[in-house]
């Protein structure tokens, strides 16, 4: 936890354990003030490491639905079309926060819960391994 | 919020707004057993639309630091080492969830709030405008 | 259980155009790929394309010219089209669905479920 | 193209004793970023569609006998049957998942003598 002083405005906790488990308003605020208020929406088709989107459902998860990034190719796509096998498609991946319902089915009772997304493909030079 | 019929083992709910506020545990279970061990550790040095990470740090946040990307360049690095103009690099962005500390520098009281990161950087083909 | 089953026309005349459609059930299709592969009689295996979860296709470039993949998913159809076939695209034509493993971050190009085939016969 | 080449074409067998069936590819199917190799092996029984039995070299479909086990790495691969079994009998495919188009071998059939 983050040791911060507690304001005397602050909701009470009851939790023996604080601040292990804390309130959570469900509403959520976006931030999403972007200058670039166009998303990443083309660019799994038009990257030279191209990829598909699957969308991954569970209703015991905040945000129930997440999309994964899967690369389409092991190598990058060249301005011809063809695939460049010299060079790799590789996942960029992101740990992000969801909530777990804990016990399960309970609608307002959570666990944090850190899970690892695919988010897209970026082209890499490979990394050659030399044999003694 | 998503209806869920609530179990008889669930915590009860004091909030009459319910299921607007919700009780979270942050013993945060990890969840990364993928099947791909690495991570894109080194992918934003190795990429050709290589990027630079940033901290950014919110103690008012959880979690307080996130790490953004940043493309370095505006196209994208050929074998040679040298930049093509010809193709442009991109930040992936991604929304994610965070908990915003609600009222202020309150240890036990969060908001979810949405945010919008880069993640890495991929390399795709521009856009063409034909001027008519 | 997962199902794919092609149907079509079992003889084509040459020149003309051969079009398959494979039915599927028992699996979602906004997270499965379904490939093309033909198999000439008494012969081996040939992928001719894909086509990805999300419409966007690959095809053999040995058969890119003439060839496309389509999707109703309305239907949980896909299509399969051939133009100006010859006696050499006599074969058994099979949809199979390719492999999704969660957790594995890139497009698999094996095939886990396959249709019974459906012998298609070019000839005057 | 990535040529696959199988041998044996033809493998007679004796049931309970062990049958092998070797996969050579023209490139490597290594994929460094992983460490996977992206081979796969299918059998089709007679009058049947092909079926999945391992792929990434070793990895066995769910439901396929544990008597069935792949190995190799790079360009040279073998699949084993630790006792072959009289349902075991058709052809065997290897293929390729890494460069596009995926190529399959030219088949061995495996037939009781």
């Known amino acids: 936890g983050i040791a911060i002083p507690r304001n005397s405005g602050c909701p009470n906790s009851e939790d023996k354990n604080f601040p292990r488990t804390v309130m959570v308003n469900l509403n959520i605020h976006n931030r999403n003030t972007s200058t670039n208020p166009k998303r990443s929406s083309d660019y799994y088709n038009r990257s030279t490491s191209p990829w598909n989107l699957h969308r991954n459902e569970d209703p015991e998860r905040y945000p129930s639905v997440i999309w994964e990034a899967k690369c389409r190719h092991l190598g990058c796509v060249k301005a011809d079309g063809n695939v460049d096998y010299h060079m790799n498609s590789v996942p960029i991946q992101q740990e992000i926060l969801v909530l777990r319902r804990e016990p399960r089915h309970c609608p307002n009772s959570f666990r944090l819960e850190k899970i690892l997304v695919s988010v897209g493909c970026t082209c890499v030079t490979p990394i050659v391994h030399h044999v003694a | 919020g998503i209806a869920i019929p609530r179990n008889s083992g669930c915590p009860n709910s004091e909030d009459k707004n319910f299921p607007r506020t919700v009780m979270v545990n942050l013993n945060i279970h990890n969840r990364n057993t993928s099947t791909n061990p690495k991570r894109s550790s080194d992918y934003y040095n190795r990429s050709t639309s290589p990027w630079n990470l940033h901290r950014n740090e919110d103690p008012e946040r959880y979690p307080s630091v996130i790490w953004e990307a940043k493309c370095r360049h505006l196209g994208c690095v050929k074998a040679d080492g040298n930049v093509d103009y010809h193709m442009n690099s991109v930040p992936i962005q991604q929304e994610i969830l965070v908990l915003r500390r609600e009222p202020r520098h309150c240890p036990n009281s969060f908001r979810l709030e949405k945010i919008l990161v880069s993640v890495g950087c991929t390399c795709v083909t521009p856009i063409v405008h034909h001027v008519a | 259980q997962v199902q794919l089953q092609e149907s079509g026309p079992g003889l084509v005349k040459p020149s003309e155009t051969l079009s398959l459609t494979c039915t599927v059930s028992g699996f979602s299709l906004p997270s499965h790929s379904v490939s093309w592969i033909r198999q000439p009689p008494g012969k081996g295996l040939e992928w001719i394309g894909i086509?990805?979860?999300?419409?966007?296709?690959d095809y053999n470039s040995a058969f890119k010219s003439r060839v496309t993949i389509s999707v109703d998913t309305s239907k949980n159809q896909f299509s399969l089209k051939l133009s100006s076939v010859t006696a050499a695209d006599t074969a058994v034509y099979y949809c199979a669905r390719n492999a999704y493993i969660t957790d594995y971050y890139y497009e698999n190009y094996f095939m886990d479920a396959w249709g019974q085939g459906t012998l298609v016969t070019v000839s005057s | 193209d990535i040529v696959m080449t199988q041998s044996p074409l033809s493998l007679p067998v004796t049931p309970g004793e062990p049958a092998s069936i070797s996969c050579k590819s023209s490139?490597?199917?290594?994929?460094?970023?992983?460490?996977?190799?992206?081979l796969a092996w299918y059998l089709q029984k007679p009058g049947q569609s092909p079926q999945l039995l391992i792929y990434?070299?070793?990895t066995r479909q769910s439901g396929v006998p544990d008597r069935f086990s792949g190995s190799g790495s790079g360009t040279d691969f073998t699949l084993k049957i630790s006792r072959v079994e009289a349902e075991d009998v058709g052809v065997y495919y290897c293929q390729q998942s890494y460069y596009t188009p995926y190529t399959f071998g030219q088949g061995t059939k495996v037939e009781i003598k």
């Open positions: 990434w070299t070793s």
């Open positions: 086509i990805w979860n999300q419409g966007g296709t």
């Open positions: 490139q490597s199917l290594l994929f460094s970023e992983n460490q996977k190799n992206y």
